[in-house]
């Protein structure tokens, strides 16, 4: 039956995807399990097969429709169950009544590009992907720049407290290779979390002009 040691966490990408992770101590490796979604006010049900991501952890994506379709709203509640096969039946291993817009995690920003680069500055833009129109401008971003000889974890976080899909990086070193990443988060939702980081964008600052003091 539903086990107290299991953890079942899901996030909605604000459009047509609910991603879930289920972890359980001592769960059988060879058991077939799935997540079943039953919305309270919609005519569709959806399932996805849980696939192992570690020794005692499984994940799957509920695809609710076309990527940019708005399949759920702020008033929807979706009953999510982890079901594992036992013989010819499916046992309920975990259950939650899921409020999509309280549990948001957007897709990573895409289409990062260098708009303009100089010796000490670089202007970068990006786009958000599959984000609901409900947010209007109620989004925030975090960005980080990887400098030579450092790790991503050491990179200071730059916070953009509004829907601003560009940044001007300053005080850069001339003729130096950098990488840049950005992530996004809606302001809405008690359990909302940051999107994954974008794919890194590599860029190089221009060399200082010869004979000029830098």
């Amino acid at each position: 039956a539903v086990n107290g040691t299991s953890q079942f966490t899901c996030f909605y990408n604000s459009r047509a995807n609910i991603s879930c992770v289920w972890s359980q101590d001592g769960a059988l490796q060879d058991t077939s399990c799935q997540v079943h979604a039953w919305p309270d006010r919609r005519r569709w049900n959806q399932t996805c097969e849980l696939l192992p991501v570690s020794q005692a952890s499984w994940a799957c994506n509920l695809i609710l429709g076309a990527p940019d379709s708005q399949k759920l709203t702020t008033v929807d509640i979706v009953t999510l169950r982890v079901l594992c096969r036992e013989g010819v039946r499916w046992r309920v291993m975990a259950i939650q009544d899921f409020k999509p817009f309280e549990n948001l995690r957007l897709m990573a920003p895409i289409s990062l590009q260098v708009v303009h680069v100089e010796t000490h500055r670089c202007n970068i833009s990006w786009e958000i992907s599959q984000a609901s129109h409900y947010f209007e401008r109620h989004l925030e971003f975090e960005a980080r720049t990887l400098s030579p000889g450092h790790t991503w974890e050491e990179a200071p976080l730059l916070t953009l407290k509004q829907k601003q899909e560009w940044i001007c990086l300053e005080t850069l070193t001339p003729d130096t290779q950098y990488e840049f990443q950005v992530r996004v988060k809606p302001l809405q939702g008690e359990f909302t979390t940051w999107s994954p980081w974008s794919q890194p964008l590599a860029f190089r600052t221009k060399p200082a002009a010869l004979g000029k003091d830098t």
Epitope: R81, L83, W90, R91, V92, I95, Q96
Partner: nanobody, 117 residues
Framework: QVQLQQFGGGLVQPGGSLTLSCVAS????????MAWYRQAPGKQRELVAS???????VYADAVKGRFTISRDNTKNTVYLQMNSLKPEDTAVYRC???????????WGQGTLVTVSS
Amino acid sequence: QVQLQQFGGGLVQPGGSLTLSCVASESISEMSRMAWYRQAPGKQRELVASITMHGGVVYADAVKGRFTISRDNTKNTVYLQMNSLKPEDTAVYRCNALGTWSDETYWGQGTLVTVSS
């Protein structure tokens, strides 16, 4: 086959209170989740409140702070205490139980709650 029998409901004035109860014919201690749904005339069914086997509770935003769900496993009963009722709470309320197995979904017969002066 588990039977769910509902009690309560009826006509109440705005601002008033009402308690619905749902009694199961068998033990509810192994029910993975008990819930109350409602459907107003011409509207979609909606989840009002739910409570899992482990006591996790969820409320629709429209009733949060006014309604309270509880379950008494010793009496095989789930309750919905409804306070500060509004005309928009008028609907048929149905009790729902989800069992240990995926095919175990049980419904009460439904009871009409009318909030009107």
